[in-house]
């Protein structure tokens, strides 16, 4: 789903029984902790050593809903992502590093601790590089892997 | 093998309401999104929302949202179509579709279709 | 809602002859389209999704292409068992919606 096409839409939904309260979590993993904002999880990430994941993605979006379920389901993510500062995002930041092939989601972005944007992992559709879809979960756990060996660091 | 058998035939009178069953075997029901899909007579496909059956959430189409509730049973691998204040024109077949078994969210399976009718 | 514009409604063809539907999206919708095949009085049976990947246990004579707005299904050679109406369906944004259909029967 590109979201530079359709900003704003509104979901049209209706639970079927009351939810917990929202959490920034936002459903893609209760368990784990989760940065509010872009300039928290990069604080976080640089001070402690760990690859930030960025998860963007859209309440309304058939595709986010259905790569949130899968992610939170799986316990190898959830077991590998706590070694991860974790941000989930419904918005755009300013940075364009962020969205290097487009603004679509969900698409799913790692930052080294040096504040280097993986660029280099990525998903397996070209038109839509840092695109997962329920299938290619075990793409994104080798991707989760491969964002944990960190770039060296110059001295 | 994935089997989704739905409820028999159903008529009801204007302003009532129907609540179509559709049972599943075959897989693991709480991790494949459930659609519901109608068809007046003689007429084309309309997509009236989805359900997930592991934590019950929920998306409707715009024009069904107030009428609509999707539910699911995980005790008998059973979800839910209910349909209020009917009129004649939700005289239609009502389908089931399973999303895809990886949690994908294309239509894969399809039950056998339950048809309401809606007359005074 | 995005809008689903399939073509022809109907066509009539030989047996053997290769036959092509269309569908058009009123937006980009990637990859996310899939093909239906609808035998009178029967639920439908899904052929492609994704736009080109075919399910299992559906003949190889049945392709699909396309991506972004145009997409196409293909039937190689035409069988007597292909008579029936043919569905597309984008799944990219809610609502998800369907083309009007193709009637397909033989000459």
């Known amino acids: 789903k590109d979201i530079t096409v359709k900003s704003g839409a509104k979901k049209d939904t209706k639970d079927s029984a009351p939810k917990l309260p929202q959490t920034l979590s936002r459903g893609w993993g209760d368990q784990l902790i989760w940065t509010q904002t872009y300039e928290e999880a990069l604080y976080k990430s640089k001070t402690s050593n760990k690859p930030l994941m960025i998860i963007h993605h859209l309440d309304e979006c058939p595709h986010s809903q259905a790569l949130k379920k899968v992610f939170a389901e799986n316990k190898e993510i959830q077991k590998l992502a706590e070694q991860f500062v974790l941000l989930n995002l419904v918005y755009e930041t300013t940075d364009k590093h962020l969205s290097p092939d487009g603004q679509y989601v969900p698409r799913i972005i790692f930052v080294d601790p040096s504040l280097t944007v993986r660029a280099d992992i990525t998903g397996r559709y070209s038109n839509r590089l840092y695109a997962y879809e329920p299938s290619d979960i075990a793409l994104l756990l080798d991707n989760m892997k491969k964002a944990l060996k960190l770039l060296k660091t110059e001295l | 093998q994935v089997q989704l058998v739905q409820s028999g035939a159903e008529v009801k009178k204007p302003g009532a309401s129907v609540k179509v069953s559709c049972k599943t075997s075959?897989?693991?029901?709480?991790?494949?999104?459930m659609n519901w899909v109608r068809q007046a007579p003689g007429q084309g496909l309309e997509w009236i929302g989805w359900i997930y059956p592991g934590d019950g959430d929920t998306n409707y189409n715009g024009k069904f949202k107030d009428r609509v509730t999707l539910t699911a049973d995980k005790s008998t691998s059973t979800v839910y179509m209910e349909l209020s204040s009917l009129r004649s024109e939700d005289t239609a077949v009502y389908f089931c579709?399973?999303?895809?078994?990886?949690?994908?969210?294309?239509?894969?399976?399809w039950g056998q279709g339950t048809l309401v009718t809606v007359s005074s | 809602d995005i809008q689903m514009t399939q073509s022809p409604s109907s066509l009539s063809a030989s047996v053997g002859d290769r036959v092509t539907i269309t569908c058009k999206a009123s937006?980009?919708?990637?990859?996310?389209l899939s093909w239906f095949q609808q035998k009178p009085g029967k639920a439908p049976k899904t052929l492609i999704y994704r736009a080109n990947r075919l399910v299992d246990g559906v003949p190889s004579r049945f392709s699909g292409s396309g991506s972004g707005q145009d997409f196409t299904l293909t039937i190689s050679s035409l069988q007597p068992e292909d008579i029936a109406t043919y569905y597309c369906?984008?799944?990219?944004?809610?609502?998800?919606?369907f083309g009007g259909g193709t009637k397909v029967e033989i000459k």
């Open positions: 937006q980009d919708i990637n990859s996310y």
């Open positions: 579709a399973r999303g895809g078994y990886d949690g994908s969210p294309w239509l894969s399976y």
């Open positions: 369906l984008q799944y990219d944004e809610f609502p998800f919606t």
């Open positions: 075959g897989y693991v029901f709480s991790r494949s999104w």
